[in-house]
Each structure stands twice: as C-alpha cells, then as structure tokens.
Interface confidence: low
Amino acid sequence: MMTGTIETTGNISAEKGGSIILQCHLSSTTAQVTQVNWEQQDQLLAICNADLGWHISPSFKDRVAPGPGLGLTLQSLTVNDTGEYFCIYHTYPDGTYTGRIFLEVLESSVAEHGARFQIP
C-alpha cells in the first residue's frame, strides 16, 4: 500500500532571466527511493539515480543545475519555461509518487506569487 505523500514548493513565479529552485520531499513512507525524475510536461529535465547520481538532459544542461538535495535549480528563465513541473519518485516497494509544481515566468519587474502546496 502506498502511504507516502509528496510536499513541494507549490505554485511559484519568478522573473524572466532569473533563477528558481524546485524542491520536493517524500514523507510518510519507509520505501527506498531508487530514482527521482524531474519533468516539464512531457520533457525529461533531469534524473537523480541513487546509484548513478545525476544526469541532466543535454538540451537543458546549460540552464539546469542539480540540487539542492533532490531538488533542481532552473537558471536564465524565459517565458517559455512557464508550465507544470513534476518530481517523480521511483521507490521500492511502493512504486511511483508524483509531485506537481506550477511555475509562471513573468516579464514584469515584480514577480508576485501565491505559493501553495500540492500534495497528491
């Protein structure tokens, strides 16, 4: 039975050209995390494998940095980076847990946000 929950940074916004940290945390389960995938809609951004470490997708290697922790740092943001991001925890024996973050990249000089947790 899957008992875990994912806590995330929620719905966030940032300014064009800036940087942002995306972070998730899996709790309430003793399952072993074997791999975490970071995806933007249908694109794979990065993988953190328990044995092999980090792999950043070549198309994002100039703008994506691993960490902190199992999180992901997005740099040199563009308006096109607006959208849904998913942290996908592959665990044993539970299976897969997914957390969702919505990022809005704003042109304006003041980036307002209403951060909320998404806990599936």
Epitope: E7, I12, A14, I20, Q23, H25, T73, H113, F117
Partner: nanobody, 114 residues
Framework: EVQLVESGGGLVQPGGSLRLSCAAS????????MGWFRQAPGKEREWVAS???????WYADSVKGRFTISADNSKNTAYLQMNSLKPEDTAVYYC????????WGQGTLVTVSS
Amino acid sequence: EVQLVESGGGLVQPGGSLRLSCAASGNTFSGGFMGWFRQAPGKEREWVASVLRGGYTWYADSVKGRFTISADNSKNTAYLQMNSLKPEDTAVYYCTTVGYGDYWGQGTLVTVSS
C-alpha cells in the same frame, strides 16, 4: 505587497554563534517555503539553506552540521541558527521565499572576525 525583514546579524568571533530571523509580512508564507542565501564581498550570492512548511530542510555542504534552519508558521518567521562560525561565513545574509527569489529582504551583515 510582500516584505521580508532580516535581523540578528553582527560581529562575532570565530567559533561563536548567531541566530538570524526573517519576518515575513503579506501573502508570502502561505506557501511555507523559505530560504537563506548569503553574499560575501566580491562574490556571487549563494544558497545556504531552505525549509518547507512540513519541516524538511536542505543545507549547503559548507554549512551542514553547523547551521540549522527552522520556521514558525504561526509567526510567519524563519530562523537560521549559526554555530561554529568561521571567517569564511562573513557575508550579508538574505532570506527569500521560493527559491532564488520572488521576494528578497534587505539582508543582515554577519562578520566573523577575531
């Protein structure tokens, strides 16, 4: 409008301790994610630690085991307890919501020197 106000900085000797506070006002802490960054003279701003409302924390390797981040949701305040301070910890310390910065405070100066 969101405002973040840091306090608690000052001059301390190597090996000493300080506790920084960051008071948030406005619609900011509802997301429950706060972070501390620092900027040393002539260097880029670097991430130090962050905390989610549920209490989970992350630390930069350079401060792990010496610094502790925490938050009091009821007071909309985040804290950074800094122990075993080193001269290389000298910097202006900033708090922020959500990663590198939807909102930033003005910073508080920490100087570690004998």
